[in-house]
Amino acid sequence: GITNINCSGHIWVEPATIFKMGMNISIYCQAAIKNCQPRKLHFYKNGIKERFQITRINKTTARLWYKNFLEPHASMYCTAECPKHFQETLICGKDISSGYPPDIPDEVTCVIYEYSGNMTCTWNAGKLTYIDTKYVVHVKSLETEEEQQYLTSSYINISTDSLQGGKKYLVWVQAANALGMEESKQLQIHLDDIVIPSAAVISRAETINATVPKTIIYWDSQTTIEKVSCEMRYKATTNQTWNVKEFDTNFTYVQQSEFYLEPNIKYVFQVRCQETGKRYWQPWSSLFFHKTPETVPQVTSKAFQHDTWNSGLTVASISTGHLTSDNRGDIG
């Protein structure tokens, strides 16, 4: 970068090289060039020569002033116009950064995806800081009082093998960058309560000719958890509103769920499960599409035919007779 150049002087920033976005800053350039009393000192930002707000302080030093600096990153360098030199002489350069101190991390969540061998912890980091921000995840056993710390720049996967202090833990997150440090509230977890069953997948659908045609959705999960509660949501692709069916499920065999649907309409289905009575749900499965036939013949949709684009819709959901807004997160 710009900081690796050979300098014939010095460049510095006040209040600091990393500063809060929107601040007024001063960049100083001091020449130390043999046989040169600089006639002028020039500043460049990202290769563009600066024209305004340059003040000469003394024979060797000039200041560039910026009001309300809003760029996350900039490469600055300065040059001197030396008498009898045809070209400007490079003095020095520096990379500068602006951003924000971290917000208090909130919505700390830790889950164990079945078979993953990891506890995955995530949180809401708050507003974008624009500068390098590190997170330290603290995991403290409530049984042994032993604390472990994990450094990361986003979420963290902690091997369940390393959680040797029993089943109950406190988890909290510390966020830090050059402009500040914040700490989340503590989350109390029990390892048995945060397991999310192996993903449920819709494999195929068929519409069976009967007096009233019915559609059967086939779906399964590799989970070994005995008590699992699931939800399947479905809607016509032209609709905004989801219909939701709830199931208490035993995955010792492939699940078959029956639906009475309108003919000649394209429907979309998704499923998700949780260990019964626990807090966290799986994310909704990939979108599974099935078009019902116009009339009599049998129609089958297979999993490999389904589209996996994300709907991104904020929709309403009908569940056991209550209309609720269904914008729940993946695991909440």
């Epitope: 009393q37 600089p38 024209r51 003040t55 024979k59």
Partner: antibody
Framework: QVQLVESGGGVVQPGRSLRLSCAAS????????MSWVRQAPGKGLDLVAD??????????YYADSVKDRFTISRDNSKNTLYLQMNSLRAEDTAVYYC??????????WGQGTLVTVSS | DIQMTQSPSSLSASVGDRVTITCRAS??????LAWYQQKPGKAPKLLIY???SLQSGVPSRFSGSGSGTDYTLTISSLQPEDFATYYC?????????FGQGTKVEIK
């Protein structure tokens, strides 16, 4: 050799607009800063507006007396400098010179064009 | 902006005289000073830049000197074509600013 030819001057009523042009030749136009300097009758020289060279990303400057009324622009493909003058006042009456600067002093000047603002 | 003060505002001299015009800046301008000559109805013409460098084609009777805040234009032997108004310009800090001018008249 360097040549600068201004045009567009004339008599105009207060509040009206005028557009000056300066056709340049004999040098690499985009590499030089271009300015409009005016001289009121019997008075000294005043920098009115400046549009800098490519290395400055064509940054513009305006004297306080013309800010929000005058606009300097350049067309590098035509080697031409412009000054759009709106809401003209009697005190804008002057000879307007187009000038070239590579460093910050004015190396070459046009012959000037007279702008008279009078009702 | 840097203020430039020229003196005298006018002077009368004869052909062959040595003439000195001074320019004072409101702060150190580190030899970033130019001198111009302007004849009636004509555009200004660059004589001196960087306080002491003679522009190509300008007669050697013109010279410039100075440092810090004080600068001088000297015409060693005034010629008939030198009767004109002279302006100094600082280009140390942006925007460049002119002195108010010195009119050199025939005595």
């Amino acid at each position: 050799q360097v040549q600068l030819v201004e045009s567009g001057g004339g008599v105009v009523q207060p509040g009206r607009s005028l557009r000056l042009s300066c056709a340049a030749s004999g040098f690499d136009f985009s590499s030089y800063g271009m300015s409009w300097v005016r001289q009121a009758p019997g008075k000294g020289l005043d920098l009115v507006a400046d549009i800098n060279s490519k290395s400055y990303n064509y940054a513009t400057y305006y004297a306080d007396s013309v800010k929000d009324r005058f606009t300097i622009s350049r067309d590098n493909s035509k080697n031409t400098l412009y000054l759009q003058m709106n809401s003209l006042r009697a005190e804008d009456t002057a000879v307007y010179y187009c000038a070239v600067h590579h460093s910050d002093y004015f190396e070459y000047w046009g012959q000037g064009t007279l702008v008279t603002v009078s009702s | 902006d840097i203020q430039m003060t020229q003196s005298p505002s006018s002077l009368s001299a004869s052909v062959g005289d040595r003439v000195t015009i001074t320019c004072r800046a409101s702060q150190d301008i580190y030899t970033n000073l130019a001198w111009y000559q302007q004849k009636p109805g004509k555009a200004p013409k660059l004589l001196i830049y960087h306080a002491s460098s003679l522009q190509s084609g300008v007669p050697s009777r013109f010279s410039g000197s100075g440092s810090g805040t004080d600068y001088t234009l000297t015409i060693s032997s005034l010629q008939p074509e030198d009767f004109a108004t002279y302006y100094c310009l600082q280009d140390s800090e942006y925007p460049p600013t002119f002195g108010q001018g010195t009119k050199v008249e025939i005595k």
